[in-house]
């Protein structure tokens, strides 16, 4: 398919040939095409390419481009060349190459698909059956991300309530650049009857921790001391805390954001591994205190800013008066 | 009590490189990022970028990704902020913030005045 | 980018008058991270409130913060003569451009 520029050109080069386009894992869409015929022999050959919206324009010297692309709609790339990586110069006529996603009922898919990535250690997707949809349908997931080697079927789907979904292992690997990829997520049924639904989870996104656990509560003078155990996988400089003191007295819910803090007072159990400790001011020991904590995700680790854990379970201590 | 301390004030012509920096103290200098903030003459506060300590990981604005560059000395509890070739857009006052990892800034340096004029 | 607005640009009052300072968020954010300034003129900002709704060390409760979503709120409830400032909402690498508080 040629698509031409309205505005006048000199000197272009010949299009682009054997443009094709194919799939690779389950998101990964690769163009590819060779040299135009007959170009001019001191032509250095640059590629200009650009989606079908216009958007991510490209000049490279290489026959290939690649998205990662959840292919629940049709995507087209344009490719033309040129003698120059000047964005300003008229590429040749531009040909166009578009891919279209699996056949099947668009209100067959099933929508509302999510994935959370729990405690960095297993990911845990969800969604609602389509509207067009058997009650009976038995669903399939399949996830691929950059270490491993094949597309992998996930086996524990589950369903609670109106959901459906499935969860498998996924483990943070010590290599740094782990995180800067996605995982490819595509939701289909056994039988073929249903349109295939993808996603795209980066990495950096939809991370819960699991929540801390208190080991320790303790009073000296005024303050109350608290000690927990933090979630295993993540590094301090990608957590913080939120330490909820309610007082059955005075009825105050106090809440504090606490940074991973070391245990050095005398009053904490030391040189605990992984624990933190956070000192509450002016708590009345002579009543009772009730303590839970939560934790998140920095949002300079992960991009995903709204997913808090689970509050641990509470903790009291000191005594409730009795009420005269 | 927590402290940043920042360098003096400098005057730069274009071209030039220039080093700025921030001694923490008062607090586990390893444990918070610290960041920087730029604030132009009679304009808002502009935020730069931030390091942390602990691991030396660095996140920059994308407007200053490549302008600038932020370090640190765990050792002796200092933060860094360089430029190699100084503009005379680069005139501005420059502060150094501490950052617990929920993203406000609790304390802040006195400020360094960087002026670029030929 | 999340850009952040503030309203208004300059607020005009009385000691002892109520201010109220809004900073919108182009998307929805975690109040989590949102942050207010207080910045006198030839003076480092200081931190006001952090995670939309709690009081820094040392601030005085005559400042309260509010908000959720993409819409925010600091309040001062009587101002006082030192309270006449630039005040900033910040959420990690976005500041709003400020909100002169002056003496009418």
């Known amino acids: 398919d040629y698509k031409d520029d309205d505005e006048s050109r000199t000197e272009t080069q010949p299009p682009v040939t054997n443009l094709s386009v194919s799939v690779e894992n389950l998101c990964t869409v690769i163009w590819t095409w060779n040299p135009p015929e007959g170009a001019s022999s001191n032509c250095s050959l640059w590629y200009f390419s650009h989606f079908g919206d216009k958007q991510d324009k490209k000049i490279a010297p290489e026959t290939r481009r690649s998205i990662e692309v959840p292919l629940n709609e049709r995507i087209c790339l344009q490719v033309g060349s040129q003698c120059s990586t000047n964005e300003s110069e008229k590429p040749s006529i531009l040909v166009e190459k578009c891919i279209s996603p699996p056949e099947g009922d668009p209100e067959s898919a099933v929508t509302e698909l999510q994935c959370i990535w729990h405690n960095l250690s297993y990911m845990k997707c969800s969604w609602l059956p389509g509207r067009n949809t058997s009650p009976d349908t038995n669903y399939t997931l399949y996830y691929w991300h950059r270490s491993l080697e094949k597309i992998h079927q996930c086996e524990n789907i589950f369903r609670e309530g109106q959901y459906f979904g499935c969860s498998f292992d996924l483990t943070k690997v010590k290599d740094s650049s782990f995180e800067q990829h996605s995982v490819q997520i595509m939701v289909k049924d056994n039988a073929g009857k249903i349109k295939p639904s993808f996603n795209i989870v980066p990495l950096t996104s939809r991370v819960k921790p699991d929540p801390p656990h208190i080991k320790n509560l303790s009073f000296h003078n005024d303050d109350l001391y608290v000690q927990w155990e933090n979630p295993q996988n993540f590094i301090s400089r990608c957590l913080f805390y939120e330490v909820e003191v309610n007082n059955s007295q005075t009825e105050t819910h106090n809440v504090f954001y606490v940074q991973e803090a070391k245990c050095e007072n005398p009053e904490f159990e030391r040189n605990v591994e992984n624990t933190s400790c956070f000192m509450v001011p002016g708590v009345l020991p002579d009543t009772l205190n009730t303590v839970r904590i939560r934790v998140k995700t920095n949002k300079l680790c992960y991009e995903d800013d709204k997913l808090w854990s689970n509050w641990s379970q509470e903790m009291s201590i000191g005594k409730k008066r009795n009420s005269t | 009590e927590v402290q940043l301390v920042q360098s003096g004030a400098e005057v730069k012509k274009p071209g030039e490189s220039l080093k700025i920096s921030c001694k923490g103290s008062?607090?586990?200098?390893?444990?918070?990022?610290i960041g920087w903030v730029r604030q132009m003459p009679g304009k808002g506060l502009e935020w730069m970028g931030v390091i942390y300590p602990g691991d030396s990981y660095t996140r920059y604005s994308p407007s200053f990704q490549g302008q600038v560059t932020i370090s640190a000395d765990k050792s002796i509890s200092t933060a860094y902020l360089q430029w190699s070739s100084l503009k005379a857009s680069d005139t501005a006052m420059y502060y150094c913030?501490?950052?617990?990892?929920?993203?406000?800034?609790?304390?802040w340096g006195q400020g360094t005045l960087v002026t670029v004029s030929s | 980018e999340i850009v952040l607005t503030q309203s208004p640009g300059t607020l005009s009052l009385s000691p002892g008058e109520r201010a109220t300072l809004s900073c919108r968020a182009s998307?929805?954010?975690?109040?989590?991270?949102l942050a207010w300034y207080q910045q006198k003129p030839g003076q480092a900002p200081r931190l006001l409130i952090y995670?939309?709704?709690s009081r820094a060390t040392g601030i005085p409760d005559r400042f309260s913060g509010s908000g959720s979503g993409t819409d925010f709120t600091l309040t001062i409830s009587r101002l006082e003569p030192e309270d006449f400032a630039v005040y900033y909402c910040?959420?990690?690498?976005?500041f709003g451009q400020g909100t002169k508080v002056e003496i009418k």
């Open positions: 995670g939309a709704s």
């Open positions: 910040q959420q990690y690498a976005s």
């Open positions: 998307q929805s954010i975690s109040s989590s991270y």
């Open positions: 913030v501490r950052m617990p990892n929920w993203g406000s800034l609790d304390h």
């Open positions: 008062g607090y586990s200098f390893t444990s918070y990022w």
